[in-house]
């Protein structure tokens, strides 16, 4: 069983609409409708599992259901990244992985899913109702985050039920561009459908598997936007929060962890070693996400096993050996 961040589903108009409208008028709307539905918003799913053998051990699995190239994955606990959560692991497809106690093993399971094993005792150990969040940064979709937790009453070895309030984030750069075209098409479609009052326009409906609609937010790497777009996570259990980074993790680390965007607040900022790095041609999206990767590096790595990397930056593709040569 997995805890998924469900996105609103666009419901297509009822059958019979074509009869009410002229065939010629319907061609473009149906093409646009198909685009709107099939190009749908990406999803992130999160599964939290307490191991039956070790009550202090958790396995968090996260996956991204989108078509873009994943450029960064961040796993945090105590709430969403940037909303008080503390980073447990950061996985970058070309620079490797960092993880911190109580993370024991972070790895890519596939090109679009990761797993993280947590264990430990004392101040840094997770407890049953801790909230775990996974954030996937992907081009062109943007940045998407979902959270899950294991209820205190869950039996060891069982997975978490669906998360009541998954959080989704769409990066501004992901919304613009390709998403902008689709958005325009969908708006135009709604306009056409509304003009023909034979049937009601398609409605955005929350997914049935989630008690409330997920909250999506766009963000940019600035304190102003962070403050304006901040969405608190209601189910954080502060009694299970990890020790503060200042005490739990001494500073230091490789230079490419040096600077952090302000959207990941609540963590110490280091020297801006990336300040001279030019913004990539594909837009500031990559730079923003790399800043997030850089941030966590203020803490020395937890000595645990770790990472599986993408075979090809172009996106999901099966591969048995290096660069598919095997």
């Amino acid at each position: 069983m997995r805890t998924e961040a469900q996105v609103p589903a666009l419901q297509p108009p009822e059958p019979g609409l074509e009869g009410a409208m002229g065939h010629r008028t319907l061609v473009l709307p149906w093409v646009l409708l198909t685009l709107c539905v099939t190009a749908g918003t990406p999803e992130v799913w999160v599964q939290v599992r307490m191991e039956a053998t070790e009550l202090s051990s958790f396995t968090i699995r996260c996956g991204f259901l989108g078509s873009g190239s994943i450029s960064l994955v961040t796993v945090s606990w105590g709430g969403p990244n940037g909303a008080g959560g503390t980073t447990l692991a950061v996985l970058h497809p070309e620079r490797g992985i960092r993880q911190w106690a109580p993370a024991r093993q972070a790895r890519w399971e596939t090109q679009s899913s990761i797993s993280l094993i947590l264990e430990g005792s004392g101040a840094s150990s997770p407890c049953a109702n801790t909230t775990f969040c996974c954030k996937f940064a992907s081009f062109p979709e943007g940045s998407w985050e979902a959270c899950g937790s294991l209820p205190p009453s869950s039996d060891p070895g069982l997975s978490a039920p669906p998360t009541p309030a998954p959080i989704l984030r769409a990066d501004l750069a992901g919304i613009l561009g390709v998403s902008g075209v689709l958005l325009f098409g969908c708006v135009y479609l709604l306009h056409l459908l509304r003009r023909h009052k034979h049937r009601p326009a398609p409605r955005l409906q929350p997914s049935r598997t989630s008690p409330q609609a997920p909250r999506a937010r766009a963000w940019a790497p600035s304190q102003a936007s962070q403050a304006a777009l901040h969405v608190p996570y209601a189910t954080i259990n502060t009694s299970c929060r990890p020790a503060t980074l200042d005490t739990a993790h001494p500073h230091g680390g490789p230079s490419w962890w040096a600077s952090l965007p302000t959207h990941a607040a609540h963590r110490p900022q280091g020297p801006a070693a990336w300040a001279s790095t030019p913004i990539p041609a594909r837009g500031s999206f990559v730079s923003v996400e790399n800043g997030l990767y850089a941030q966590a590096g203020e803490r020395p790595p937890h000595t645990g096993p770790g990472l599986t990397l993408f075979p090809d930056p172009r996106g999901p593709r099966a591969m048995e050996g290096p660069l598919g040569v095997r």
Partner: antibody, heavy 126, light 107 residues
Framework: EVQLVESGGGLVQPGRSLRLSCTAS????????MSWFRQAPGKGLEWVGY??????????EYTASVKGRFTISRDGSKSIAYLQMNSLKTEDTAVYYC?????????????????WGQGTLVTVSS | DIQMTQSPSSLSASVGDRVTITCRAS??????LNWYQQKPGKAPKLLIY???SLQSGVPSRFSGSGSGTDFTLTISSLQPEDFATYYC?????????FGGGTKVEIK
């Protein structure tokens, strides 16, 4: 055939600059990260830095000893990676290699380099 | 940075011998360990990636094992063309680092 060919090495005085080129063929250049390595005479291998693939914005990273002096860039249209070396020091004397970076995932996981170019010798001496 | 320590730094062996080279990482790197072969005046060549996976075209007499901090490269039956220097490299995170190398010489 996948191939990398370095060029641009030679004798240079301390404090001067040199630019190395790595011409790639046989694969889609923009899809992979490229790294530069060096090997001082009679010594082991040292990673110099890398430039990311197009998918990740072509970001760069360097080893501490060359940061601020060396710059890696790439020209996708020519399938060439460059290593611009400024303020050269005698300790930069080495054979410089470029290599294609690769990733694997799942139970077989690592970040590895294959193939490598033949290398070009850079001698920094007065 | 992750330090990689190789041993021995050199060894002498005969054709047909079984040769074992070890590599130790300063912290756990799971299976993110690669092995390269380098002959004098030549570029390094990838032999093993992900600790135990044989790169395409590499003879099956080469094998790798290990996980965490301790890794081993084994040549089951040394051939004349195998006399070279072998390096391990961690593929866990940047900066990518190498062991000091093990030179395999003819006895």
């Amino acid at each position: 055939e996948v191939q990398l060919v370095e060029s641009g090495g030679g004798l240079v005085q301390p404090g001067r600059s040199l630019r190395l080129s790595c011409t790639a063929s046989g694969f889609t250049f923009g899809d992979v990260a490229m790294s530069w390595f060096r090997q001082a005479p009679g010594k082991g291998l040292e990673w110099v830095g890398y430039i990311g693939s197009k998918a990740y914005g072509g970001e760069t990273e360097y080893t501490a000893s060359v940061k601020g002096r060396f710059t890696i860039s790439r020209d996708g249209s020519k399938s060439i990676a460059y290593l611009q070396m400024n303020s050269l020091k005698t300790e930069d004397t080495a054979v410089y290699y470029c290599a294609r970076a690769g990733h694997s995932y799942g139970s077989i996981a690592s970040n590895w380099f294959d193939p490598w170019g033949q290398g070009t010798l850079v001698t920094v001496s007065s | 940075d992750i330090q990689m320590t190789q041993s021995p730094s050199s060894l002498s062996a005969s054709v047909g011998d079984r040769v074992t080279i070890t590599c130790r990482a300063s912290q756990s790197i799971s299976s993110y360990l690669n092995w390269y072969q380098q002959k004098p005046g030549k570029a390094p060549k990838l032999l093993i990636y992900g600790a135990s996976s044989l790169q395409s075209g590499v003879p099956s007499r080469f094998s790798g094992s290990g996980s965490g901090t301790d890794f081993t490269l084994t040549i089951s039956s040394l051939q004349p063309e195998d006399f070279a220097t072998y390096y391990c490299q961690q593929g866990f995170y940047t900066p990518w680092t190498f062991g000091g190398g093990t030179k395999v010489e003819i006895k």
